[in-house]
């Protein structure tokens, strides 16, 4: 009933709780002398379903047959309407539509840990939409029984609050769950189990790792477990990996040696436990232990390259470059690099430790045979040294690779191709492709990049440190014993017309011709490799087309003569630059009048 129902009653037949699809009869009847004044025909009883009118009747009672009610609760309210007055609430009723409980499925029980309590879960099946009570029953040896009830609306878990002990691990226990509501009842199939079947050990705790003599090859994992644990499984992985290594161990008694860990690597370790070989379930995984393995001396050898630069008749500058070892080769934090420079005939040697850099520059005499050795050191030792004999890398013209080309290959890649040298191609032991940003003036501080290619390759894709709209000087070296030959080319991964033209800084007269000098276009405005400069000139105040002279681009060139100007005529001159994508805008304009004699 919704309220006190002083004025009348609402009755529901056959029941307030009905099976989905059933019909109900709702009757609203006024109590004596509770209708409208005057006479009963004025009474108008109105039936509401929630807040909407669905039926009416004139008189002392209203009878309504209702079908098709949805699952859940529907509220019906009866009101009385009299002429010239507001409706008066008479009474109401809630009707609960649902279904009988389905048979609970997949009943399973576990006890978490040897000291834990037995708890069971099951699948309720479809929602009954009605108040449904679940009773869980457990029976054991010696006619012992335990019972627990659950009155939750969505009940699918109950904890008995009792602890099974290992005194008789093979004793049978049987659990059963029964669901009851107003429309029926249903019981699960019984689930029978022993102590060993349902006790799920607590996850191992207090996990530690020890490295004997700070060595990765002598590593032991320690942990603590509940007393009855027989089996463990260990899983571990480098912290940056998604794949686990898995190990199963029996009777480990809280320790296990690991033999395949990599040095100087952070690992994550987890352990799980089980009481019996084929009964029961594994514990949850333990909390993770994270630990870094000790360093080992580096393996592998550094990839070393060098550049020679002539200083004067007696001295040359050597710049050495090397690449970092990979993490798996470094096997620790590289503390320094050891560079040894040795004159091979006189035996003089100089050793230097270098930290924080992967390059080294020194000046040596141009005479003598020089060699360098470079190794990387961590706290445990050094890598094997990489030895290189310093030679003139481009001296052997017959070893120079032929038909070198450089083409853009997608975003920020350049494909370099070449043909083997004329000299017996089988003499080539390896190719080295070297590239660096092109800087007029040949700035030696510009980073050098290189890659090595097998002797049977005739192409290499370079992508490391390649930027769009930058021109690179690319060299291909063919190395054979203590000889080398090289060829070079300019290349870019992406280009467009330069953003500005060269700036003419001077025009000088020399024997009837002029010499134009200009400043290079700033690198960031070149927008790729320059192919040509153009010098334009025309008579001042003339509307005629300008004449032009096109000069192939050379890195160091910044002046050019022109000898086709007429004396005592004032000319306007300007310059542009071209890449493969097009021509720049004009540089500055300069006026000039040649003073020489007329022919």
């Amino acid at each position: 009933k919704i309220d006190a129902c002083k004025r009348g009653d609402v009755t529901v037949k056959p029941s307030h709780v009905i099976l989905l699809g059933s019909t109900v009869n709702i009757t609203c009847s006024l109590k004596p002398r509770q209708g409208c004044f005057h006479y009963s025909r004025r009474n108008k009883l109105i039936l509401y379903k929630f807040d909407r009118r669905i039926n009416f009747h004139h008189g002392h009672s209203l009878n309504s047959q209702v079908t098709g009610l949805p699952l859940g609760t529907t509220l019906f309210v009866c009101k009385l309407a009299c002429i010239n007055s507001d409706e008066i609430q008479i009474c109401g009723a809630e009707i609960f539509v649902g279904v009988a409980p389905e048979q609970p499925q997949n009943l399973s029980c576990i006890q978490k840990g040897e000291q834990g309590t037995v708890a069971c879960t099951w699948e309720r099946g479809r929602d009954t939409h009605l108040y449904t009570e679940y009773t869980l029953q457990l029976s054991g040896p010696k006619n012992l029984t335990w019972q627990k009830q659950c009155k939750d609306i969505y009940c699918d878990y109950l904890d008995f609050g009792i602890n099974l002990t290992p005194e008789s691990p093979e004793s049978n226990f049987t659990a059963k769950v029964t669901a009851v509501n107003s429309l029926g009842s249903s019981s699960s199939l019984p689930s029978t189990f022993t102590f060993l079947d349902i006790v799920r050990p607590l996850p191992p705790w207090d996990i530690r790792i020890k490295f004997q003599k700070a060595s990765v090859s002598r590593c032991t994992l320690y942990w603590r477990d509940e007393g009855l644990v027989l089996l463990n499984r260990l899983r571990y992985r480098p912290s940056n990996s998604r794949l686990w290594n898995m190990v199963n161990v029996t009777k480990a008694k809280g320790r296990h040696d690991l033999l395949d860990l990599k040095p100087f690597t952070e690992y994550e370790f987890q352990i799980s436990s089980k009481l019996h070989l084929y009964k029961g379930s594994w514990s949850d995984w333990s909390e993770s232990l994270r630990a870094q393995t000790p360093e080992e001396e580096p393996t592998g050898m550094l990839d070393v390259w060098y550049m020679k630069r002539h200083i004067d008749y007696s001295r040359q500058q050597i710049s050495l470059f090397w690449k970092n070892l990979s993490v798996s080769e470094a096997r620790g934090k590289i503390l320094h690099y050891q560079v040894t420079l040795q004159e091979l005939t006189g035996g003089k040697a100089m050793t230097q430790n270098i930290t924080g850099h992967t390059s080294w520059t020194t000046v040596i005499p141009r005479t003598g045979n020089w060699a360098v050795a470079v190794s990387a050191a961590n706290s445990k030792g050094s890598s094997l040294p990489t030895r290189i004999n310093i030679m003139n890398l481009c001296e052997a013209g017959l070893l120079a690779p032929r038909q070198v080309s450089a083409n853009s290959e997608g975003m920020d890649n350049i494909l370099v191709t070449w043909q083997p040298p004329r000299k017996d191609p089988s003499a080539v032991q390896e190719y080295v492709v070297e590239w660096r940003e092109l800087h007029p003036g040949g700035d030696t501080q510009v980073p050098l990049n290189w890659l090595r290619s097998r002797p049977y390759n005739v192409s290499a894709l370079i992508s490391e440190n390649i930027k769009s709209y930058i021109c690179y000087e690319i060299r291909v070296y063919a190395l054979s014993g203590d000889q080398g030959g090289c060829s070079s080319i300019l290349g870019n991964s992406k280009h467009k017309a330069p953003l500005s033209g060269p700036h003419i800084n001077a025009i000088t007269e020399e024997k009837g011709s002029i010499l134009i000098s200009w400043n290079s276009i700033p690198v960031q405005e070149q927008m790729g490799c320059l192919l040509h400069y153009r010098i334009y000139w025309k008579e001042r105040d003339s509307n005629s087309q300008p004449q032009l002279c096109e000069i192939p681009y050379r890195v160091s060139q910044n002046s050019h003569p022109i000898n086709s100007l007429q004396p005592r005529v004032t000319y306007v001159l300007w310059m542009t630059a071209l890449t493969a994508a097009g021509e720049s805008s004009h540089g500055n304009e300069r006026e000039f009048c040649l003073q020489g004699k007329a022919n």
Partner: nanobody, 123 residues
Framework: QVQLVESGGGLVQPGGSLRLSCAAS????????MSWVRQAPGKGLEWVSA????????SYADSVKGQFTISRDNAKNTLYLQMNSLKPEDTAVYYC????????????????WGQGTQVTVEP
């Protein structure tokens, strides 16, 4: 889904008769009281008549009392309106709808409405 389809409208001379029908589907017709409402050209909605779910109680607007008769056949899921002695002021579109009350303002819900049938009374 809910469907109410009115029929039986048309052009009739003053004093003539028409019988409107409304075929219901998509809901449990016998659960609900039903109504006829009308809308004359350029006017608002006007409640005409109502009948309860089992047909034992009816109500009429004063303007049509004694002239119109509402009835229903739950077996056929059909609502009827018998209109006699028709007058030009009865010209309107007639709608069949789930009963919401006996005043024009009760009909704010449009979820149980038909598309209407036109009745025109003119000499």
């Amino acid at each position: 889904q809910v469907q109410l389809v009115e029929s039986g409208g048309g052009l009739v001379q003053p004093g003539g008769s028409l019988r409107l029908s409304c075929a219901a589907s998509g809901f449990t017709f016998s659960n609900y009281a039903m109504s006829w409402v009308r809308q004359a050209p350029g006017k608002g909605l006007e409640w005409v008549s109502a009948i309860n779910s089992d047909g034992t109680s009816t109500s009429y607007a004063d303007s049509v009392k004694g002239q119109f008769t509402i009835s229903r056949d739950n077996a056929k899921n059909t609502l009827y309106l018998q209109m006699n002695s028709l007058k030009p002021e009865d010209t309107a579109v007639y709608y069949c709808t789930k009963w919401e009350g006996d005043t024009d303002s009760d009909y704010k819900f449009k979820d149980y409405w038909g598309q209407g049938t036109q009745v025109t009374v003119e000499p």
